[in-house]
C-alpha cells in the first residue's frame, strides 16, 4: 500500500507528512491504524494532527506503529500510511543503520550536505552539525540555511554527519537530530560564468489577474559537481525573504543534470492570486557562482 517509513528518537520532536499529497484545501484525517482511533487535532495533545502533518511533540517509543491518513477532496478519498518507529537514544556515539537517512556524495567542488526532513519543522538558523558525534568547528565548515558546506573537501571528510536543530511549536522548543552518510567522490568537472537559460533578458510574461503564476529561473554553471552555484529571485532588487508578501514564495533550487553533463539549477517563484501591483514589480533572476553574477529581468503584463 501507499506507505512511507518515518523514524525518530524518543524525547525529540518528530513530524511526519502524509505520504498521500493533496491540495492544501483538502481535509486530512489521521488514525492510529491498530485501533482505528482518530488522532486529535488539538495542539494541547502530545501527538496531534495538523492537516497533512502528524506531530509527535515529543515522541515516545510507544508511539511506534502504523498511522493512516485519509485525504479528502470533494469527490475522492485517498489513503496513505505512515509507518513510524521511535527508537531509544543510543548511549554511545554510534548511529545504527536504521537511523540513517540516504547517503549523499560530494566532491571538491560540491560538498553540500542537506539536513534531512528539516523542511517539515519550524526551525531557525543556525543548524548545529556533528561528524561522527564531534561538533564541527573551523572555517572549513559553513552552516548555510538547511545544509552544510565543506570547503576543500578531502577523502577523510567522508563519514556520518548529524544535524541538530530546535523545532518551535507554540512557544515550546523541541530538539531534533538527523544523520546521514557523506561520501567523497573524485569528479573531473569545470565551472563557467553562469548562463541563464530562462527567462530571456527583459522578457515579459502575460498573466491573468487573480490567477496563480510561476516564474522559473534556470541557470547552468559548468560541467560536473559545482562548489558554489545559486539561483534566486529578487523583487525590485530585494531578496524574496525581505519582501513581506506571503503570496510570493520562492522554492528551494532544484539541481538538474543534462545529458551533456551540464550542471544546472532551477528556482521557481510562485505568485498566488496575481494582483495589479505585481505588474509594477521588476523580477530579477540571479545566477551566482565563483566566477560572478548574471542577472536577467522579467516583467509581468496583463493578458
Amino acid at each position: 500500500k501507499f506507505s512511507k517509513q518515518s523514524w525518530g528518537l524518543e524525547n525529540e520532536a518528530l513530524i511526519v507528512r502524509c505520504p498521500r499529497q493533496g491540495k492544501s484545501s483538502y481535509i486530512v484525517d489521521w488514525y492510529y491504524s491498530q485501533t482505528n482511533k482518530s488522532i486529535p487535532t488539538q495542539e494541547r495533545n502530545r501527538v496531534f494532527a495538523s492537516g497533512q502533518l502528524l506531530k509527535f511533540l515529543p515522541a515516545e517509543v510507544a508511539d511506534s506503529g502504523i498511522y493512516t491518513c485519509i485525504v479528502r477532496s470533494p469527490t475522492f478519498n485517498r489513503t496513505g500510511y505512515a509507518n513510524v518507529t521511535i527508537y531509544k537514544k543510543q548511549p554511545d556515539c554510534n548511529v545504527p543503520d536504521y537511523l540513517m537517512y540516504s547517503t549523499v556524495s560530494g566532491s571538491e567542488k560540491n560538498s553540500k550536505i542537506y539536513c534531512p526532513t528539516i523542511d517539515l519543522y519550524n526551525w531557525t538558523a543556525p543548524l548545529e552539525w556533528f561528524k561522527n558525534c564531534q561538533a564541527l568547528q573551523g572555517s572549513r565548515y559553513k552552516a548555510h540555511k538547511s545544509f552544510l558546506v565543506i570547503d576543500n573537501v578531502m577523502t577523510d571528510d567522508a563519514g556520518d554527519y548529524t544535524c541538530k536543530f530546535i523545532h518551535n511549536e507554540n512557544g515550546a522548543n523541541y530538539s531534533v537530530t538527523a544523520t546521514r552518510s557523506f561520501t567523497v567522490k573524485d569528479e573531473q568537472g569545470f565551472s563557467l560564468f553562469p548562463v541563464i537559460r530562462a527567462p530571456a533578458h527583459n522578457e515579459t510574461k502575460e498573466v491573468e489577474i487573480g490567477e496563480n503564476t510561476n516564474l522559473t529561473c534556470s541557470a547552468c554553471f559548468g560541467k560536473g559537481a559545482q562548489f558554489l552555484a545559486t539561483v534566486q529571485w529578487q523583487l525590485n532588487g530585494n531578496k524574496i525573504t525581505d519582501f513581506s508578501e506571503p503570496r510570493i514564495q520562492q522554492e528551494e533550487g532544484q539541481n538538474q543534470s543534462f545529458s551533456n553533463g551540464l550542471a544546472c539549477v532551477n528556482t521557481v517563484l510562485r505568485i498566488a492570486d496575481v494582483k495589479e501591483e505585481d505588474l509594477l514589480l521588476r523580477y530579477d533572476c540571479l545566477a551566482l557562482n565563483l566566477h560572478g553574477l548574471r542577472r536577467h529581468t522579467i516583467r509581468l503584463s496583463r493578458k
Partner: antibody, heavy 123, light 107 residues
Framework: EVQLLESGGGLVQPGGSLRLSCAAS????????MIWVRQAPGKGLEWVST????????AYADSVKGRFTISRDNSKNTLYLQMNSLRAEDTAVYYC????????????????WGQGTLVTVSS | EIVLTQSPATLSLSPGERATLSCRAS??????LAWYQQKPGQAPRLLIY???NRATGIPARFSGSGSGTDFTLTISSLEPEDFAVYYC?????????FGQGTKVEIK
C-alpha cells in the same frame, strides 16, 4: 455538471497541422490539470500530454514530443492541442480529460472525459 | 516507461457470472492504479482508483484489489451493461500508461 467538449478534428495530409480545442464547463477550470489521450481505431488508450492548472508546466509522450504543443486559456476555460508534422500513426480519436487531484509533480486518474474528436491523417 | 499487461485479452461470460480481470505492471506502482470501462463509441469511464476504491456512482459489484505489480478487477455478477472493454492505468510516474485492454463479451 462537468462537461468537456472537443472540436477541431478532421482529415489532414501527412506533414500537415491541426489544432484541437476542448471547451470545459461546470468546474473551476484553472484549478485542474488537463490531459489529452488518444485512441487509434480499434486500439487501446495512449496518453499524449498533460498541462498543469496554471499552464506553466507541460509533459508529452515521446511519440509526439517536438511536434505537439498543449496549452490552455484559463480565461476561456479552453484546452488546446496544436499538432504539427502529422503522421499516419497520429490517426486516432483524441479525448480531453480532467485530472481531479493533481499536486505538483504527481498524477492521478481521469475522472471526466470528452466525447472525443477524430483526427485522420491520410493522403 | 511502465508497461501494463492485461489478461486475458478476451473473456467470454454469461450474465450473472463472475468476471476476474488481471493487470500486471513491469515494476511496482504501489497502489497508483485505476480501472476504466469503455463501451463502443463512448469515452472511457472511471471505475476504480488507488487500486481498490470505487469512484462515485460505481455499483458495488465492481471491486479492485492488488498492490505493487499485480492487480485484479472483479465484477461479482455480470449485468448486461457490463459487457465492454476494461483498461487499467498507472499514474505513479510519467508517462501515464494504459494496459492494452480486456474485452468482456457475452458467451
Amino acid at each position: 455538471e462537468v462537461q468537456l467538449l472537443e472540436s477541431g478534428g478532421g482529415l489532414v495530409q501527412p506533414g500537415g497541422s491541426l489544432r484541437l480545442s476542448c471547451a470545459a464547463s461546470g468546474f473551476t477550470f484553472s484549478s485542474y490539470d488537463m490531459i489529452w489521450v488518444r485512441q487509434a481505431p480499434g486500439k487501446g488508450l495512449e496518453w499524449v500530454s498533460t498541462i498543469r492548472g496554471e499552464g506553466g508546466t507541460t509533459a508529452y509522450a515521446d511519440s509526439v514530443k517536438g511536434r505537439f504543443t498543449i496549452s490552455r486559456d484559463n480565461s476561456k476555460n479552453t484546452l488546446y492541442l496544436q499538432m504539427n508534422s502529422l503522421r499516419a500513426e497520429d490517426t486516432a480519436v483524441y479525448y480531453c480529460a480532467r485530472d481531479p487531484w493533481s499536486t505538483e509533480g504527481s498524477f492521478f486518474v481521469l475522472d471526466y472525459w470528452g466525447q472525443g474528436t477524430l483526427v485522420t491523417v491520410s493522403s | 516507461e511502465i508497461v501494463l499487461t492485461q489478461s486475458p485479452a478476451t473473456l467470454s461470460l454469461s450474465p450473472g457470472e463472475r468476471a476476474t480481470l488481471s493487470c500486471r505492471a513491469s515494476q511496482s506502482v504501489d497502489d497508483d492504479l485505476a480501472w476504466y470501462q469503455q463501451k463502443p463509441g463512448q469515452a472511457p469511464r472511471l471505475l476504480i482508483y488507488d487500486a481498490s476504491n470505487r469512484a462515485t456512482g460505481i455499483p458495488a459489484r465492481f471491486s479492485g484489489s492488488g498492490s505493487g505489480t499485480d492487480f485484479t478487477l472483479t465484477i461479482s455478477s455480470l449485468e448486461p451493461e457490463d459487457f465492454a472493454v476494461y483498461y487499467c492505468q498507472q499514474y505513479i510516474t510519467a508517462p501515464l500508461t494504459f494496459g492494452q485492454g480486456t474485452k468482456v463479451e457475452i458467451k
